[in-house]
């Protein structure tokens, strides 16, 4: 059994998240993950989910009673999601920590926008432009 | 030329982001994107970058002078990054809008944690477990 399982059960107790009523009004993440089978689509969604958990854990960083559980789970996320590559994790953390209200950050983001956009679609790297990328479908 | 280019140039003027000093102290996004060649790694990073721009644009939604530019760019992001798939975009937006301080959201997130973790690595879906996923490297 992966180390995170026991620690996640510990967090369930702490957050009182084991009760059946927690599942009322649908899921946060599981339903969305079910929709996406392709690896690149899943990474788009999981990227947001992992950053949510990191933010959540940060909010409870001073609570000693769950520190071991949180650290174990974060460590396992590093292994599973970032394939144990610290550089990947560091780049990810940099992106999540940029402040959208910082004027210098805003200027830089707008300065880089054209180049970021040019790289957004896989087609941009191969020189192909798929017909599916010419219309915003419902 | 893609429609976003002209509108991004317009935003550069608005944010005073065309000056050479904007590039001082390195890039926000471009240096990070340069590090990652594999599509799934790029999606992890681009997911955070796109959500940053959406947040930034939201902060300026009441500024009429740049509304057309913002809408055009957002539209082109939908085309390029979400491959014009509205469901993909909607699921993404749901994830970015969850509040990390909402107690019900916290409880749900912890309730789903074990299942989310089980799905994080590509290995989880194929039943293989790579040796590389056993240690968090530097």
């Amino acid at each position: 059994q992966d180390p995170y399982v026991k620690e996640a059960e510990n967090l369930k107790k702490y957050f009182n998240a084991g009760h059946s009523d927690v599942a009322d009004n649908g899921t946060l993440f599981l339903g969305i993950l079910k929709n996406w089978k392709e690896e690149s689509d899943r990474k788009i969604m999981q990227s947001q989910i992992v950053s949510f958990y990191f933010k959540l854990f940060k909010n409870f960083k001073d609570d000693q009673s769950i520190q071991k559980s949180v650290e174990t789970i974060k460590e396992d996320m590093n292994v599973k999601f970032f394939n144990s590559n610290k550089k990947k994790r560091d780049d990810f953390e940099k992106l999540t920590n940029y402040s959208v209200t910082d004027l210098n950050v805003q200027r830089k983001a707008i300065h880089e926008l054209i180049q970021v956009m040019a790289e957004l679609s896989p087609a941009a790297k191969t020189g192909k432009r798929k017909r599916s990328q010419m219309l915003f479908r419902g | 030329q893609d429609p976003y280019v002209k509108e991004a140039e317009n935003l550069k003027k608005y944010f005073n982001a065309g000056h050479s000093d904007v590039a001082d102290n390195g890039t926000l996004f471009l240096g990070i994107l340069k590090n990652w060649k594999e599509e799934s790694d790029r999606k992890i990073m681009q997911s955070q970058i796109v959500s940053f721009y959406f947040k930034l644009f939201k902060n300026f939604k009441d500024d009429q002078s740049i509304q057309k530019s913002v809408e055009t760019i957002k539209e082109d992001m939908n085309v390029k990054f979400f491959n014009s798939n509205k469901k993909k975009r909607d699921d993404f937006e749901k994830l970015t809008n969850y509040s990390v301080t909402d107690l019900n959201v916290q409880r749900k997130a912890i309730h789903e944690l074990i299942q989310v973790m089980a799905e994080l690595s590509p290995a989880a879906k194929t039943g293989k477990r790579k040796r590389s996923q056993m240690l968090f490297r530097g």
């Epitope: 394939n83 550089k87 | 968090f136 530097g138």
Partner: antibody, heavy 120, light 111 residues
């Protein structure tokens, strides 16, 4: 201050065995991955093996896989390398190194090394 | 697996600047951190650069590290060369199979 002290080196015949130890102090031993790196006389550095902080995960260079076993005793703050079926090409100074995180990558601190000579 | 290739030797006069390259074959240089170690004769290696370009405390700012994606290589630059910089320098990185790899080493001679 981090201190790493290797011991257990010496002269051994081809096919023989040797067990190296590395006594660690000055840091929380169980929180860091540890590695063994070797250097043959007049040659460059070669990574040999690594182990996670808990000891649950171990890694080996292809050249030693199946012959060497890395282990640790966190209660004694000690790292080990059991070397079996030794060959002449295993002759080297063996360094114990503390990784910069509970992670392979940056070998932050090194011991002084212990010399292993495999010869008949 | 991948390899890291360094020049065998570099020599320069005191006060000058040298750059040692470390070219990665297999995988992207930017996707994994690169470290640089200094090893003086008869002593254990010590870190001069980690995480591509960070310096441990005590390492002078004459030492700097960089990454160049276009050539898939890392570089160690030593400016204001001093006689005490004479040593072997090794680059080191890793890959997704949990293999740590060192470059072959570069002997730096201060003329």
């Amino acid at each position: 201050e981090v201190q790493l002290l290797e011991s257990g080196g010496g002269l051994v015949q081809p096919g023989g065995s040797l067990r190296l130890s590395c006594a660690a102090s000055g840091f929380t031993f169980s929180s860091y991955a540890m590695s063994w790196v070797r250097q043959a006389p007049g040659k460059g550095l070669e990574w040999v093996s690594a182990i996670s902080g808990s000891g649950g995960s171990t890694y080996y260079a292809d050249s030693v896989k199946g012959r060497f076993t890395i282990s640790r005793d966190n209660s004694k703050n000690t790292l080990y390398l059991q070397m079996n079926s030794l060959r002449a090409e295993d002759t080297a100074v063996y360094y114990c190194a503390k990784d910069g995180w509970n992670a392979l990558g940056w070998l932050e601190s090194w011991g002084r090394g212990t010399l292993v000579t495999v010869s008949s | 697996n991948f390899m890291l290739t360094q020049p065998h030797s570099v020599s320069e006069s005191p006060g000058r600047t040298i750059t040692i390259s470390c070219t990665r074959s297999g995988g992207s240089i930017g996707s994994y951190y690169v470290q640089w170690y200094q090893q003086r004769p008869g002593t254990a290696p010590t870190t001069v650069i980690y995480d591509d370009k960070k310096r441990p405390s005590g390492v002078p700012d004459r030492f700097s590290g960089s990454i160049d994606s276009s050539s898939n290589s890392a570089s160690l630059t030593i400016s204001g060369l001093k006689t005490e910089d004479e040593a072997d320098y090794y680059c080191q990185s890793y890959d997704s199979n949990n293999l740590v790899v060192f470059g072959g080493g570069t002997k730096v001679t201060v003329l």
